[in-house]
Amino acid sequence: AVNGTSQFTCFYNSRANISCVWSQDGALQDTSCQVHAWPDRRRWNQTCELLPVSQASWACNLILGAPDSQKLTTVDIVTLRVLCREGVRWRVMAIQDFKPFENLRLMAPISLQVVHVETHRCNISWEISQASHYFERHLEFEARTLSPGHTWEEAPLLTLKQKQEWICLETLTPDTQYEFQVRVKPLQGEFTTWSPWSQPLAFRTKPAALGKDT
């Protein structure tokens, strides 16, 4: 089903992982496909097997080395190919010359923790994971807080336009359960996108002291 609309999209996590998604309408679910990476200035090639994630899309991770190793730089170009088995041979289904640092998507922030909580405010910190030292401080964050009776989609986005791995949430309601998420994006890269949202951190504000005006 070559005539079905197809798309191939990959992102580099800035260290040692290129994650790819291949979608093709009308393709058979049991089709065996893989992504092959061929850098222009490295001695290694890498392949990963595309595994189904939905009716018409497949995904895989090209693991280039240890998670925190810097396997690619801003000058690298990686030729990526989608290969699908047809009978006894492999057929090229998509090709792309991929500039890793133009196509960044970092790992979700980790280690979220409540530093300090009061009745109306909460200080939360987090860490970035597997982010290149090349960025120095050129990162930005978005955060959102889930309030009772609302959805994540309704939560207003808080933007941190600098590498600030903490936030002080204010004007919270006492004795109330909240959840918090954060995501990160480098400033570099024409096709760079936000990381996935972090795992939600649940916290509860302190109850108002009895007899005190709140």
Partner: nanobody, 125 residues
Amino acid sequence: EVQLVESGGGLVQAGGSLRLSCAASGRTFSTTEMGWFRQAPGKEREFVAAITWTGRGTMYAESVEGRFTISRENAKNMVYLQMNSLKPEDTAIYYCAAARRGRAAVRSEGGYDFWGQGTQVTVSS
């Protein structure tokens, strides 16, 4: 925005050769994946070949593999399709296509945003 103009089509005998050219205008050409498609009378437009922006990656339709070669010259904003051992079934209008910058070259028309007007290739037996 990329504008594409094809040339080099014509009438050729079976077994002969033609070289199609695609002239591109637009500053983003040198980092854009390119492809050739064709449409025979009464048939749908079909994929022929594609090339990545550095020229390191190429792919071909099964029907033309080993006979056609896609190449490009970024300094001149040109893409070429060298067609050898032509067959009557290669008769079609040949279109040059450009993917949006940052997107992969694929075998489906939907992967390409910019198209030329086409050049006619007729192979007589």
